[in-house]
């Protein structure tokens, strides 16, 4: 029987700036039963504060809710372990909620092709930035990338669309039934999940183009 | 505890390219942005570029653009440099270090920093 | 890019000293500078980050002060072992820059 390892924080994570979440990794046991408790403090701050929240994230998490969030400000946290033999600590882990970001997926992907007379035919696919995200106040701005593929196909074909909410694709397969999806992220943060796929059927009368895709 | 683990001196030819490896061990290598830093002898630190191991997803400093590829490997919680085209210019110290938290790039662990030479 | 200026490249001091390091921006930053502290033949040590934030370890007669654009470090009863090169860094806006270093040394 032993005190535990060390802790580790590994992850945290916001839908939105307005509240995060952290998980941490147990170390060893040391065999005997372990009580986790995190604390933190504010940069500039010298009063330790304990996790306001234990249940919302799941096992070995903390949830700090919007009361608690504050940005622009780090977060210095560590996990301590104890159990009857001693207590071991985390490193500490600073955080600053503007860079833990991770947005829920783009909403309303339309995907349509458009065959104008004058031109060749293309793919032009639009999408909505995720509700949670304010970008009028100008604390975000939002990247996002596109994957398609055959429907058929085994590997995805990727373009980054930068600030856009619309990107157009010249080079497809006629007569071949596409999946579209697009996900985000903040210019610092975490990708999103990819949108969930959208279906595209190309005409068989569809024109290949030398020229790969072109944004707006 | 933490370390960042970099080979001490690679020589190169001109014109020739070059991978530097920063092995990170003590955390979890996805947790924390990795960066490189350049220092010329006797001269000061300039920035590189930064890669987010998690995804892979990178920035660079305009100037080194098209000398410098950031990449990693996961599975070993390896960080990649590699250097191409390279010319006396190009010798220096180069050091990998850890982002300082989920935050602002400040860096709180370096590697000891690869020497490279660049000479026929 | 935002430039960082060391303008002492060199300082002469004494152990028991209380020395200012200066460091100027080319625009604002507001508090987004971190000083490291680097030893011959070592790799760069994080002193200070957010303008005036003691990193884990560091002692308490390494003190920074500024935001903005004009920022101090001060080392208060300068010991031997603080005879290196210290650089600042600003990561207020891509890409993060350094100043060029001032080197303390004994008078």
């Known amino acids: 029987q032993l005190p535990p390892g060390k802790p580790e924080i590994f992850k945290c994570r916001s839908p939105n700036k307005e509240t995060f979440t952290c998980w941490w990794r147990p170390g060893t046991d040391g065999g005997l039963p372990t009580n986790y408790s995190l604390t933190y403090h504010r940069e500039g701050e010298t009063l330790m504060h304990e996790c306001p929240d234990y249940i919302t994230g799941g096992p070995n998490s903390c949830h700090f809710g919007k009361q608690y969030t504050s940005m622009w400000r780090t977060y210095v946290m560590m996990v301590n372990a104890t159990n009857q033999m001693g207590s071991s600590f985390s490193d500490e882990l600073y955080v600053d909620v503007t860079y833990i970001v991770q947005p829920d997926p783009p909403l309303e992907l339309t995907v349509e092709v458009k065959q104008p007379e004058d031109r060749k035919p293309y793919l032009w696919m639009k999408w909505s930035p995720p509700t949670l995200i304010d970008l009028k106040t100008g604390w975000f701005t939002l990247l996002y990338e596109i994957r398609l593929k055959p429907e058929k196909a085994a590997e995805w074909e990727t373009h980054f669309a930068g600030q856009q909410t619309e990107f157009k694709i010249l080079s497809l397969h006629p007569g071949q039934k596409y999946l579209v999806q697009v996900r985000c992220k903040p210019d610092h943060g975490y990708w999103s999940a990819w949108s969930p796929a959208t279906f595209i059927q190309i005409p068989s009368d569809f024109i290949m183009n030398d020229h790969h895709h072109h944004h707006h | 505890q933490v370390q960042l683990q970099q080979p001490g001196a690679e020589l190169v030819m001109p014109g020739s390219s070059v991978k530097l490896s920063c092995k990170a061990s003590g955390y979890t290598f996805t947790t924390y942005w990795m960066h490189w830093v350049k220092q010329r002898p006797g001269q000061g630190l300039e920035w590189i570029g930064e890669i987010d191991p998690s995804d892979s997803y990178s920035n660079y400093n305009q100037k080194f653009k098209d000398k410098a590829t950031l990449t990693v490997d996961k599975s070993s919680s390896t960080a990649y440099m590699q250097l191409s085209s390279l010319t006396s210019e190009d010798s220096a110290v180069y050091y990998c270090?850890?982002?300082?938290?989920?935050?602002?790039?400040?860096?709180?662990?370096w590697g000891q920093g690869t020497l490279v030479t660049v000479s026929a | 890019d935002i430039v960082m200026t060391q303008s002492q490249k060199f300082m002469s001091t004494t152990v028991g000293d209380r020395v200012s390091i200066t460091c100027k921006a080319s625009?604002?930053?507001?508090?987004?500078v971190a000083w490291y502290q680097q030893k011959p033949g070592q790799s760069p040590k994080l002193l200070i980050y957010?303008?005036?934030n003691r990193y884990t370890g560091v002692p308490d007669r390494f003190t920074d002060s500024g935001s903005g654009t004009d920022f101090t470090l001060t080392i208060s009863n300068l010991q031997s072992e603080d005879l290196a090169d210290y650089f600042c860094?600003?990561?207020?806006?891509?890409?993060?820059?350094f100043g060029g270093g001032t080197k303390l040394e004994i008078k």
């Open positions: 270090a850890r982002n300082g938290g989920l935050g602002p790039a400040w860096f709180s662990y």
């Open positions: 957010s303008a005036s």
């Open positions: 625009q604002y930053v507001g508090t987004a």
């Open positions: 860094q600003q990561y207020s806006s891509y890409p993060w820059t």
